[in-house]
């Protein structure tokens, strides 16, 4: 990756993540250095026929670091905190080369949940009002809502007139998405008014 | 024990060619690059250029680009230096070298001395 | 190019004195600094690699430092055997480039 373009790569909370260092064949390197937010993170000395020198410099990320045969760097048990702008300079006997990475650490999905507020109106009409909702939601995770294949809303809420006397069973499935997950949960209309129907008339009697 | 092996002298005419060879032995000649340095009286040593005899790359100081060609055969170990288009100044001791992996030269042949007269 | 200007080009001293030669690059060095011995009809031997560490064999009264663009050899309690002419070496970048050498005499 050029210094211009940084790479974006995703990690999830907790997991691990490596950021992929293009190592150029053939040449003879005489050093990598690994900084993160401008920090140094590690120097290393490579070598083809003995174990490489590696300084590990940053005491903060220093036993959450590894470095694969190539020497991309491998971060473990990532944190929120972890978040930010990497750079990886190779020096070799010709030149510099650069690549650039911005890590974003999401958390993986987890209980989506669906809340609704259903109205029984005389006409028969049932009218549901669905919130989809997930643990620990950020600004990463989308939700939409869709039914058949459509989308219907873009947004954790959605409003729909259900007629029984005139409407198919019908399910409206929320997905909630992130860089790294996805969880999806599924309501059925036919379900949801039924059971405010008969609320409707335990209430009545 | 680790060596390079160079012959010791040839006399070459001016315009002519010279193919110098540095045979090593010790060692996996594969995986180590090989340099070749020139040493005049009272001119000091200067680097010519180096050879990867693994993967066969090599690089060439700008200003022998157009007078030496560095080829290996690893069949027999062995590391070639043409100089091409000789001429009185080229007269000089011609050192072979082993560069270690934290980049010195931790070997040397004995050197051939290169005597162009006509 | 990295230029190096080594200095002094010739040096006299006595026996169990101490000396040092210097070595100033055109352009900042990491570590990749190394000093050599050539003997009168001999091979270049190496001395010092990576700026400060001693080859095997090499006996501890030679020394190398220096960072960026200035180092040096410091030889402490000379000896006869170390009549020479030493030579430093940068190999950070291409073209490698030796300094000019010094040659070491005994009062």
């Known amino acids: 990756q050029s210094s211009l373009t940084p790479l974006m790569v995703n990690g999830i909370l907790g997991e691990s993540v490596t950021l992929p260092l293009e190592f150029p064949a053939g040449e003879k390197v005489n050093f990598i250095t690994w900084l993160f937010n401008e920090t140094s993170l590690a120097f290393i000395v490579p070598h083809e026929t003995k174990s490489p020198e590696i300084h590990v410099t940053n005491p903060k990320q220093g036993k959450r670091l590894n470095f694969t045969q190539s020497y991309s760097l491998q971060l473990s048990n990532l944190k929120m905190e972890d978040t930010g702008s990497y750079r990886a300079q190779i020096s070799t006997k010709t030149s510099a080369k650069l690549s650039s990475y911005t890590l974003r650490i999401l958390r993986q999905l987890r209980n989506i949940q669906v809340t609704n507020h259903s109205q029984l109106f005389q006409n028969m009409t049932c009218e549901l009002h669905l919130t989809c909702s997930v643990e620990d939601a950020d600004d990463n995770v989308s939700f939409r809502w869709e039914a058949l294949g459509n989308t219907l809303s873009s947004q954790p809420n959605l409003t729909v007139s259900w007629d029984p006397r005139i409407s198919s069973e019908q399910d409206y499935t929320c997905i909630a998405e992130n860089a790294v997950s996805n969880l999806s949960f599924s309501v059925s209309a036919q379900k949801l008014c039924e059971d405010v129907k008969i609320q409707y008339t335990d209430t009545k009697m | 024990q680790v060596q390079l092996l160079q012959p010791g002298a040839e006399v070459v005419k001016p315009g002519t060619s010279v193919k110098l060879s540095c045979k090593a032995s010790?060692?996996?000649?594969?995986i180590y690059w090989i340099n070749w340095v020139k040493l005049r009286p009272g001119q000091g040593l200067e680097w010519?250029?180096?050879?990867?005899?693994?993967?066969?790359?090599?690089n060439l100081n700008e200003k022998f680009k157009t007078k030496a060609t560095l080829t290996v055969d690893t069949s027999s170990s062995t590391a070639y230096m043409q100089l091409n288009s000789l001429a009185f100044e080229d007269s000089a001791l011609y050192y072979c070298?082993?560069?270690?992996?934290?980049?010195?030269?931790?070997?040397w042949g004995a050197g051939t001395t290169v005597t162009v007269s006509s | 190019d990295i230029q190096m200007n080594q200095s002094p080009s010739s040096l006299s001293a006595s026996l169990g004195d101490t000396i040092t030669i210097t070595c100033r690059a055109s352009?900042?060095?990491?570590?990749?600094f190394n000093w050599y011995q050539q003997k009168s009809g001999n091979i270049p031997k190496l001395l010092i690699y990576?700026?400060?560490n001693l080859h095997t064999g090499v006996p501890p009264r030679f020394s190398g430092s220096g960072s960026g663009t200035d180092f040096t050899l410091t030889i402490s309690s000379l000896q006869p055997e170390d009549i020479a002419t030493y030579y430093c070496?940068?190999?950070?970048?291409?073209?490698?480039?030796f300094g000019g050498g010094t040659k070491l005499e005994i009062k």
């Open positions: 010519i250029g180096d050879i990867h005899p693994g993967r066969g790359n090599t």
């Open positions: 070496l940068q190999s950070q970048s291409y073209p490698y480039t």
């Open positions: 010790g060692y996996n000649f594969t």
């Open positions: 070298a082993r560069e270690d992996e934290d980049w010195y030269f931790d070997v």
């Open positions: 352009q900042g060095i990491s570590i990749w």
């Open positions: 990576k700026t400060s």
